[in-house]
C-alpha cells in the first residue's frame, strides 16, 4: 500500500487540527543547527504526515524532517538564519497547514549544566555556579538565566532569581537553618535572538548549617 493518503484519508485529515509548534537550537552540534516540531494535540494521528521547511535555506529550496516517534526533527548547516522560512505539515504533496517563521525567533537554548553550590563559612553565604555551552557559541551567546530554589519540604514554593552571569550569591540569613534545599537553573535567549526557556538543569541539593546557639548564627 502506498505511503500517501487515499482520497478518503485526505478528507478526514482536513477535519483535524494540525496546529504545531517548533523550536530551533543553533550550533547544537558543532556548526550544525537543529529544528524540532511537534503537534500541539498529542492525539493527532501522525501516520502519513510529514513536515517540510522551505525558504531561507542555503543551497537548497526545501528540507524534509525526520520523524522520531511523536516529534519531527532536522539537523543541518543549511539554515540561512536570515528571513522567514515556511514550515508545512504535508500529506503527500498536499500542505495541510503552514507557518512562516524566522528561526532566530524560536531559539531554545541548551540546558545549563554543572550546577553546584559552595558554602563560604567566613562570608556566611552560598556561591551558586553553573556552566552553559553557549559561552563558546558564535550566535546565541547572550542568555538570561533563571535560578530557582526551594526548601525540599515546600513542594511548590520556588524562589526565582534572574541573572545574566553564571554565578549567584545566596545570603545565609535568607535561608532556613538546618534545611535541605533543591536548586536548578534554565536559560532563555537575551538580545539578538528570541525564543523559549531551555530545559531545567539537573537539580542540585544542599543543606544549610544549623544555628550556633551562642552567637545566633548558623554553624
Amino acid at each position: 500500500e502506498s505511503g500517501y493518503a487515499q482520497n478518503g484519508d485526505l478528507e478526514d485529515a482536513e477535519l483535524d487540527d494540525y496546529s504545531f509548534s517548533c523550536y530551533s537550537q543553533l550550533e547544537v552540534n558543532g556548526s550544525q543547527h537543529s529544528l524540532t516540531c511537534a503537534f500541539e494535540d498529542p492525539d493527532v494521528n501522525t501516520t502519513n504526515l510529514e513536515f517540510e521547511i522551505c525558504g531561507a535555506l542555503v543551497e537548497v529550496k526545501c528540507l524534509n524532517f525526520r520523524k522520531l516517534q511523536e516529534i519531527y526533527f532536522i539537523e543541518t548547516k543549511k539554515f540561512l538564519l536570515i528571513g522567514k522560512s515556511n514550515i508545512c505539515v504535508k500529506v503527500g504533496e498536499k500542505s495541510l497547514t503552514c507557518k512562516k517563521i524566522d528561526l532566530t525567533t524560536i531559539v531554545k537554548p541548551e540546558a545549563p549544566f554543572d550546577l553546584s553550590v559552595i558554602y563560604r563559612e567566613g562570608a556566611n553565604d552560598f556561591v551558586v555556579t553553573f556552566n552553559t555551552s553557549h559561552l563558546q557559541k558564535k550566535y546565541v551567546k547572550v542568555l538570561m538565566h533563571d535560578v530557582a530554589y526551594r526548601q525540599e519540604k515546600d513542594e511548590n514554593k520556588w524562589t526565582h532569581v534572574n541573572l545574566s552571569s553564571t554565578k549567584l550569591t545566596l545570603l545565609q540569613r535568607k535561608l532556613q537553618p538546618a534545611a535541605m534545599y533543591e536548586i536548578k537553573v534554565r536559560s532563555i535567549p537575551d538580545h539578538y535572538f528570541k525564543g523559549f526557556w531551555s530545559e531545567w538543569s539537573p537539580s542540585y541539593y544542599f543543606r544549610t548549617p544549623e544555628i550556633n546557639n551562642s552567637s545566633g548564627e548558623m554553624d
Partner: nanobody, 118 residues
C-alpha cells in the same frame, strides 16, 4: 507611500569608500530581514548582503565579502552598506530590500546610483 528610500550614492574614485543608507517606513522593520542588491548596466540585479532582524546574523556574496559591511539601526528604521576598496566593477544602481519570506523579498526601494571611476 514610498516605503524604502536609499541614499548615499555618488561618484567615487577606485579604492575609495561610500556608505549607503536605506530608511524604511514599514511598521515591521525591526522584525524584518534586510538586503542590499545592485544592478550594473546591462546586467541582472545581483545579491550583495543581507542582515537578520536583530543584526546578529549577516550574509555576503563572494564578490563583496571583506570589502562591504551591512549593518542596521532598528531605532532609526535604517539599514546601511559600508563599501570600502571600491572597484570600477562595483558601478551600478544599488537597491535595498525588506522582509525576506520564503526566498522572496517583499519590498524594494527605487535605488541609488554608485559610479566608481578608475
Amino acid at each position: 507611500e514610498v516605503q524604502l528610500v536609499e541614499s548615499g550614492g555618488g561618484l567615487v574614485q577606485a579604492g575609495g569608500s561610500l556608505r549607503l543608507s536605506c530608511e524604511s517606513s514599514i511598521s515591521t522593520f525591526s522584525s524584518d530581514a534586510m538586503g542590499w542588491f545592485r544592478q550594473a548596466p546591462g546586467k541582472e540585479r545581483e545579491f550583495l548582503a543581507a542582515i537578520g532582524w536583530s543584526g546578529a546574523v549577516t550574509h555576503y556574496s563572494d564578490s563583496v565579502k571583506g570589502r562591504f559591511t551591512i549593518s542596521r539601526d532598528n531605532a532609526k528604521n535604517t539599514v546601511y552598506l559600508q563599501m570600502n576598496s571600491l572597484k570600477s566593477e562595483d558601478t551600478g544602481r544599488y537597491y535595498c530590500a525588506e522582509d525576506y519570506v520564503t526566498d522572496v523579498w517583499q519590498y524594494w526601494g527605487q535605488g541609488t546610483q554608485v559610479t566608481v571611476s578608475s
